[in-house]
């Protein structure tokens, strides 16, 4: 469930802090409820970038697990189509700390509406 997703995000945050990765990532910091699935997709795609750049097994496995969890939770809600949402590349670029904080925020949005 989404609580597991948040714990994975916390784990990724801890792992990244010890690695000093200074990438900037497309970050949706003001998610409109009607675009939350699209925003989630952008967060997950950017997480893959972190995983790729880190070359770290723990980060890789945690990111993969997070994607598997999110996939299963969202698939159980049926196919959700959203329109008029920003493309990932249109989002503001932020540092990893801000990116992860925004990610936790969107997950909490899913928790509150489930």
């Amino acid at each position: 469930n989404w609580v597991n997703v948040i714990s994975d995000l916390k784990k990724i945050e801890d792992l990244i802090q010890s690695m000093h990765i200074d990438a900037t990532l497309y970050t949706e910091s003001d998610v409109h409820p009607s675009c939350k699935v699209t925003a989630m997709k952008c967060f997950l795609l950017e997480l893959q970038v972190i995983s790729h750049e880190s070359g770290d097994t723990d980060i890789h496995d945690t990111v993969e697990n997070l994607i598997i969890l999110a996939n299963n939770i969202l698939s159980s809600n049926g196919n959700i189509t959203e329109s008029g949402c920003k493309e990932c590349e249109e989002l503001e670029e932020k540092n990893i700390k801000e990116f992860l904080q925004s990610f936790v925020h969107i997950v909490q949005m899913f928790i509150n509406t489930s």
Epitope: S51, H52, D58, D61, N71
Partner: antibody
């Protein structure tokens, strides 16, 4: 050439336990997630378990959850499947398979071992 | 759970002729990141399964180019442009977009 050798199969009574092993060679074992897939005699394929590269994350279908445990020892290049509370319907050839990472663009079971037969019968 | 349904279950083909196998999923298997994790496996008699196609249409290394995959959403197809004797066996589609990962029932290809 990637090599996967499954072993440990045999005859076991219902309710019994068995541990399967899969020895990997000719590739960097710790860089790949791994899976077990089974095939009952004359039947189709059924996914049984998957484990992440480092071994922290495991995934199962409901049919084996709570009874089977997938694990790995990266220092020994070996994958395991601990099977408890075995039932007649667990009778099958068990294959181990290497899984390409989702993040590197694949997420497919690209190489398979030769399989080991598990028979559950009294 | 995602149910994968293959058709036909038996496929008699003349050597040199094309063959086509359909696989339909009970729901879309496009994942949250936009990927469709749909594979095709071949299992020759007495052998282990072998990966042919991954992510719908990508041919795995060493797989002859007479094999091709296509489809999207819930409908997928494996095509063999010209069947050869070594193609005899059972073909399975498989989705690993969503846990539990699931196989189709298999399609047995035989020579007429």
């Amino acid at each position: 050439e990637v090599r996967l050798m499954a072993s440990g199969g045999g005859l076991v009574q219902p309710g019994g336990s068995l541990r399967l092993s899969c020895a990997a060679s000719e590739f960097t074992f710790s860089n790949y997630a791994m899976s077990w897939v089974r095939q009952a005699p004359g039947k189709g394929l059924e996914w049984v378990a998957t484990i992440s590269r480092g071994g922290d994350y495991t995934y199962y279908p409901d049919s084996v959850k709570g009874r089977f445990t997938i694990s790995r020892d990266n220092s020994k290049n070996t994958l395991y499947l601990q099977m408890n509370s075995l039932r007649a319907e667990d009778t099958a050839v068990y294959y181990c398979a290497r899984r390409v990472s989702m993040i590197t663009g694949g997420w497919a079971m690209d190489y398979w071992g030769q399989g080991t037969l598990v028979t559950v019968s009294s | 759970d995602v149910v994968m349904t293959q058709s036909p279950l038996s496929l008699p083909v003349t050597l040199g002729q094309p063959a086509s196998i359909s696989c339909r999923s009970s729901q879309s298997i496009v994942d949250i990141t936009g990927n469709t994790y749909l594979e095709w496996f071949q299992q020759r008699p007495g052998q282990s399964p072998r990966l042919l196609i991954y992510k719908v249409f990508n041919r795995f290394s060493g797989v002859p180019d007479r094999f091709s995959g296509s489809g999207s959403g819930t409908d997928f197809t494996l095509k063999i442009s010209r069947v050869e004797a070594e193609d005899v066996g059972v073909y399975y589609c498989f989705q690993d977009s969503f846990v539990p990962y699931t196989f189709g029932q298999g399609t047995k290809l035989e020579i007429k």
